[in-house]
Amino acid sequence: QRFAQAQQQLPLESLGWDVAELQLNHTGPQQDPRLYWQGGPALGRSFLHGPELDKGQLRIHRDGIYMVHIQVTLAICSSTTASRHHPTTLAVGICSPASRSISLLRLSFHQGCTIASQRLTPLARGDTLCTNLTGTLLPSRNTDETFFGVQWVRP
Amino acid sequence: QRFAQAQQQLPLESLGWDVAELQLNHTGPQQDPRLYWQGGPALGRSFLHGPELDKGQLRIHRDGIYMVHIQVTLAICSSTTASRHHPTTLAVGICSPASRSISLLRLSFHQGCTIASQRLTPLARGDTLCTNLTGTLLPSRNTDETFFGVQWVRP
Amino acid sequence: QRFAQAQQQLPLESLGWDVAELQLNHTGPQQDPRLYWQGGPALGRSFLHGPELDKGQLRIHRDGIYMVHIQVTLAICSSTTASRHHPTTLAVGICSPASRSISLLRLSFHQGCTIASQRLTPLARGDTLCTNLTGTLLPSRNTDETFFGVQWVRP
């Protein structure tokens, strides 16, 4: 069904401006490279309008093209630390359903202590996004240093 | 078909698509870590549609969730310079009203000469955003190396 | 004034939500610093809705303010390699028509192997965007490491 036809008398919700901005809750147990996120007004400036959290991972509720963005800063880090613990890598991907599993965005820290990037990608209702941080260094939980979000852009 | 023709019963203002992209004007005097921005068609590719500049700082005119983005490149910089002058840090935050003062986004340069990031954040009418660059290195004023902008995303 | 009330008679096309996300096809021949891009559902998660590719370069079809974003990762790269081959620089600009030629966004790799940034910029129908990578290092063609996209934001 074309968006244009359904679009004629539609309120904000139907425009599908789903959006979420999350802050880091915690890292996973040993052998689980995933970062676990949290969001909501009680936590400060994080929020979920449309997408939901499922055990700390972000689940999409509306099909469309999304802008996905992330910043992760390593805690207790200097360029020396970063290069000594290289490679520390951050990957954002669809981790479920398994049939749609794919890496969407990947960066290594090399001699830096922060990575930040963004990209446009099609996502479908039910896609769960996971952010995997591999390496021994811990991410900062400061809300201005580590965050992850999505923004619905168009059908 | 031009957007304007199809647009006749919808003033753009009501869409709330406030947006601004600024270029660096100058750094502050000693003891003032703020960067001072400028924008407008006479200056090239910078612009303000909705938000305003107040003494070089960006003031928001419409409540909503915004995508805030920034890139700052240090002038006369190499990885050696950057690490020797470490820590050089860039922070973007709400600096007024004082009651809403908070750091939204923070990055250190470590051994790099450019930082770039973006995030979604709720902003309210009257919020003024400040960008603080701490350290002794100067930012480049080249318009393709240093810029700061906001984009209204949804109410 | 609520967006929902004003929204009632606007089809998607007239909203002008042109958007594209491209993956790297190849680098240019000797003496051509341009990166050549490709996009489309057959290639995975890249797409063009509005803009077009012209010999691997992105051509804009609708006037407006766009969010331009890019990530480029160097292949076979370590912080040592990156600094040894310095300066490796990535620039995104309007390369045609010649009368509008300008650099929009520029970053150097220094000791890092990935650059990522984004900015808002006015673009006009017919503008062709080129991404120039100067230096001897090759970019990764992995779709989660190197990508380039634009998103129409407002008229």
Partner: antibody, heavy 118, light 107 residues
């Protein structure tokens, strides 16, 4: 210094399954592509496939669906299984690390000669 | 798949000679080409990546050139330790493919 050490059965009968394991020492497992490459006696090199540390694998279509590459990140090991082998699969099998973005095989195992004979 | 054609398949040369090996690909691959050296009973070793970048620790008598579909490996002054087999390999796409090899023998 990164070292790759590989092991597995060297003599197989047709229709059996080839099974090799490669252990990575002295370096990180994450951030790299881990590959298998083979070389029939007196011939050139053939890429079998690779697996990224996240578990995503890509195989050479010429080997159809006979190939399975898996990894065990807890042991810093990755493995190759090639089923329904024939004499044409007789070769020296190498494990190798695909550096950074998988664009260069910068570290190799010592190689294992696998002979398929009835 | 990208087909790789290496020539010659073998050559005889003397110490001090200049040796050139060529590699042609069936489609455009930019500069996504590596060169490896392999000695009998040993694993291959990278010499050149990205068509022309010398791998750290490799002597400067080795050089690579070309882009697109035609590539060359040159050894300016052949040394005794250079007698070996040489392979080109494309990393433009999967499956990664190798040339059939060039064996450099002592004349």
């Amino acid at each position: 210094q990164v070292q790759l050490q590989q092991w597995g059965a060297g003599l197989l009968k047709p229709s059996e399954t080839l099974s090799l394991t490669c252990a990575v020492y002295g370096g990180s497992f994450s951030g790299f592509y881990w590959s298998w490459i083979r070389q029939p006696p007196g011939k050139g090199l053939e890429w079998i496939g690779e697996i990224y540390h996240s578990g995503h694998a890509t195989n050479n279509p010429s080997l159809k669906s006979r190939v399975t590459i898996s990894l065990d990140t807890s042991k810093n090991q990755f493995s190759l299984k090639l089923n329904s082998v024939t004499a044409a699969d007789t070769a020296v099998y190498y494990c190798a690390r695909g550096g950074n973005s998988g664009y260069i095989f910068d570290y190799w195992g010592q190689g294992t000669l696998v002979t398929v004979s009835s | 798949d990208v087909q790789m054609t290496q020539s010659p398949s073998s050559l005889s040369a003397s110490v001090g000679d200049r040796v050139t090996i060529t590699c042609r690909t069936s489609q455009y691959i930019g500069r996504y080409l590596n060169w490896y050296q392999q000695k009998p009973g040993k694993a291959p070793k990278v010499l050149i990546y990205g068509a022309s970048t010398l791998q750290q620790g490799v002597p400067s008598r080795f050089s690579g050139s070309g882009s697109g579909t035609d590539f060359t490996l040159t050894i300016t002054s052949l040394q005794p330790e250079d007698f070996a087999s040489y392979y080109c390999q494309q990393t433009y796409s999967t499956p990664r493919t190798f040339g059939q090899g060039t064996k450099v023998e002592i004349k």
